[in-house]
Interface confidence: medium
């Protein structure tokens, strides 16, 4: 595939990544699928600077990110190491609350109204942010 050198229309470029901010709500899995179909992934936050950038764009609205523990340990959807990476949880979060009866705990992470993170029920219809890296090989064939 060809290298992506600029962001698609309606995406925002920042620090060699492209971001797309939804204006509607989906369950985490549907949001995850949406990003994949765009040759992207749910946003992976790797620094305080990126956290501030995303927070600025989403405002005080619950918004899914690409972090989940549906299979046990917390994992970023792009494989970024969770244990050594950036974290911005609210106090006493994640609490992986099991009381909801959905099986497992609260398995999907989202930005809360103040930007800090919380784990929540993955079926909630929150907004989401897609991210794709510039300079990565896109799945589209090169233009001849």
């Amino acid at each position: 595939g060809s290298e992506r050198t600029c962001c698609p229309v309606n995406w925002v470029e920042h620090e060699r990544s492209c971001y797309w901010f939804s204006r509607s709500g989906k369950a985490w899995a549907d949001a995850d699928n949406y990003c994949r179909l765009e040759d992207a992934h749910l946003v992976v936050v790797t620094s305080w600077e990126e956290q501030k950038f995303v927070q600025h764009h989403i405002g005080p609205v619950n918004t899914w990110m690409g972090l989940h523990d549906q299979n046990g340990p917390w994992k970023w959807v792009d494989g970024t190491d969770y244990e050594t990476g950036f974290k911005n949880w609210r106090p006493e979060q994640p609490d992986d609350w099991y009381g909801h009866g959905l099986g497992g705990g609260e398995d999907c992470a989202h930005f809360t109204d103040d930007g800090r993170w919380n784990d929540d029920v993955c079926q909630r219809p929150y907004r989401w942010v897609c991210e794709t890296e510039l300079d990565k090989a896109s799945q589209e064939p090169p233009l001849l």
Partner: antibody
């Protein structure tokens, strides 16, 4: 104080259209999601539709999908429900209600309701 | 879609009684549940949100509990003004659905 006042109800024939309005006051309208809920005579409550605080996301009950449209006008602090292709089973009191948050957290404040009767 | 089943559909009680109404969801809904009170000819009034949080201005005789699929609304000491119909609502996701209602009548 927070207040929601519905209007626009009345008697209408099947297949015709009607637009309900809900005037909001006493709070920052643009910061809250808004719902329509209805109640058929002698029946329980039925959620109809929601619109997020900024109008970006709209969701409907299956029973009205494709026929009803929810919208809002921030300059007028007003919520609307455009009802097309009305059926006898749409006869109900229609309430507007404020979401507890931007559009996904249920209702906290309700209007007094407006009655819609669909009859030939 | 998630179904909400309330029980009983009606009950008779006396002033001073402790009354319990239950609501069951067809699947787990975490604590995304609210309770409303409605009197004849009036709009519903919010009582409880997030399963157990009391709406501002609602007297503490009302309490809610439960999580997952089973929820309870309790009125600790029934007063004349409490005779009404009570509804639960789930708001985990769309579509939101109400329970069928519980009518609390005077014995």
């Amino acid at each position: 104080q927070v207040q929601l006042v519905e209007s626009g109800g009345g008697v209408v024939q099947p297949g015709r259209s009607l637009r309900l309005s809900c005037a909001a006051s006493g709070f920052t309208f643009s910061s809250y999601g808004m719902h329509w809920v209805r109640q058929a005579p002698g029946k329980g409550l039925e959620w109809v539709a929601v619109i997020w605080y900024d109008g970006s996301n709209k969701n409907y009950a299956d029973s009205v999908k494709g026929r009803f449209t929810i919208s809002r006008d921030h300059s007028k602090n007003t919520l609307y429900l455009q009802m097309n292709s009305l059926r006898a089973e749409d006869t109900a009191v229609y309430y507007c209600a404020r979401d507890r948050d931007v559009g996904y957290n249920g209702m906290d404040v309700w209007g007094q309701g407006t009655t819609v009767t669909v009859s030939s | 879609d998630i179904q909400m089943t309330q029980s009983p559909s009606s009950l008779s009680a006396s002033v001073g009684d402790r009354v319990t109404i239950t609501c069951r969801a067809s699947q787990g809904i975490s604590n995304y549940l609210a309770w409303f009170q409605q009197k004849p000819g009036k709009a519903p009034k919010s009582l409880i949100y997030a399963a157990s949080n009391l709406q501002s201005g609602v007297p503490s005789k009302f309490s809610g509990s439960g999580s997952g699929t089973d929820f309870t609304l309790t009125i600790s000491s029934l007063q004349p003004e409490d005779f009404a119909t009570y509804y639960c609502l789930h708001y985990l996701n769309y579509p939101l659905t109400f329970g069928g209602g519980t009518k609390v009548e005077i014995k």
